[in-house]
């Protein structure tokens, strides 16, 4: 906190300029009018103030706007944004995507800070949903942003926004998140033709049900093993050997290297060994030839 002292004669700031870096902290407090600072915030971003001087400028803005800064000031905060607390940011009403971008730029290259997380939360809540432009912006700055949302939060993403999602944006998503995103992606890409559709939907397939995988197996998609390994185990288990062969195409050979890992391991246990042998990959662990597989519900009906 800087003591309240009168501004020395001739030092009253008429504009925000480089000469202010030569002011001591108490002189900045005494000689810079907060309203002038608010209207010329963009200039602060071009002047190499010390961190201590910036603290004084923030203090002046806090006094001028105890209920929270107006967006005209927020847009030009620059580095001062990083000096804000989440409590400060919760007082703001940020509606412009340009303001959001300007503040995200300041933090670019760093992990998502508590300030940024609070800002994004305020912005998205203000908009009511995660629209395409917002999602585009957020994933550009933070590729993992989408996967940081809960399934409940993801449910507010409209299908149209899915067009903004890149494969790397889904890298850290878990199956519960993909369960929410997959139906939206399916809806978003429904008018695309086979090969184009597969390219777009591929990253979301960790949320796909069995019937959709069966349908894809009829389209010569040649799914790679990395994608296959991310599929839901419960969706893979009912697939036949022939369907998996069609689904993977030339990549089917990769099953051998993954035979001890889920979902491949569990799928193998459900297949007849003679069906697995048709692949010629040496996959072992299937149901031995000559064994009957009885559905328990069927067994009860027989007795």
């Amino acid at each position: 906190e800087v003591e309240k002292t009168a501004c020395p004669s001739g030092k009253k700031a008429r504009e925000i300029d480089e000469s202010l870096i030569f002011y001591k902290k108490w002189e900045l407090e005494a000689c810079v009018d907060a309203a002038l600072l608010a209207t010329q915030m963009d200039r602060v971003n071009a002047i190499p103030f010390t961190y201590e001087q910036l603290d004084v400028l923030k203090h002046k803005l806090d006094e001028l706007y105890p209920q929270g800064y107006p967006e005209s000031v927020i847009q030009h905060l620059g580095y001062l944004f990083l000096k804000m607390s989440p409590e400060d940011i919760r007082k703001w009403n940020v509606t412009s995507l340009e303001t959001l971008k300007a503040l995200l730029e300041v933090n670019k290259g760093h992990e998502m800070s508590p300030q940024v997380a609070t800002l994004i939360d305020r912005f998205v809540k203000g908009r009511g949903q995660l629209d395409k432009d917002t999602l585009d912006t957020l994933t550009a700055f933070y590729p993992g942003y989408l996967c940081s949302l809960s399934p409940e939060e993801l449910s507010s993403v409209p299908p149209s926004s899915i067009w903004a999602v890149r494969p790397q944006d889904l890298d850290t998503c878990d199956p519960r998140q993909l369960d929410v995103l997959y139906p939206k992606a399916r809806l978003a890409f429904q008018n695309m033709n086979g090969s184009e559709y597969f390219v777009k939907i591929q990253s979301f397939l960790g949320g796909a049900p069995t019937e959709d995988l069966k349908a894809l197996s009829q389209q010569n998609v040649s799914m790679d093993l990395a994608t296959f390994m991310k599929l839901r185990t419960d969706a893979v288990l009912p697939l036949t050997v022939a369907e998996v062969q069609k689904l993977l195409g030339p990549h089917v050979e990769g099953l051998k290297a993954e035979e001890r890992h889920r979902p491949v391991r569990d799928w193998i246990l459900r297949q007849r060994q003679d069906d697995l042998d048709t692949l010629g990959l040496g996959l072992q662990g299937g149901i031995p030839n000559g064994y009957l597989v009885l559905d328990l519900s069927m067994q009860e009906a027989l007795s």
Epitope: V44, A46, T50, Y51, G78, Y79, E105, V106
Partner: nanobody
Framework: LQLVESGGGLVQPGGSLRLSCAAS????????IGWFRQAPGKEREGVSS????????NYADSVKGRFTVSRDNAKHTVYLQMNSLKPEDTAVYYC??????????MGQGTSVTVS
Amino acid sequence: LQLVESGGGLVQPGGSLRLSCAASGFTLDNYAIGWFRQAPGKEREGVSSISSSGGSTNYADSVKGRFTVSRDNAKHTVYLQMNSLKPEDTAVYYCEGVGDYGRRAMGQGTSVTVS
């Protein structure tokens, strides 16, 4: 973002030193740079500043006519030429920068002793 100052040392009154400020891991070219100094037990004070293009320079009254700030964007370095040094110029000298979107960079300082 880290800046690195160098060129400090011990010099006699009336002598000269040239301080350098270079960027570590990024380029300084679009950063406006300020030189500051802090004497023991005193507040940090501004010494000079230079715009990103080098077209605009400013000086504190206490160093006007003695210090000159310049930049060589080809070498990604900003200089502070200090002539006619006085004992009261003794301090740790820091450079601080401001770039696009108000991004800030600062250094650890270099010590200047005039004695």
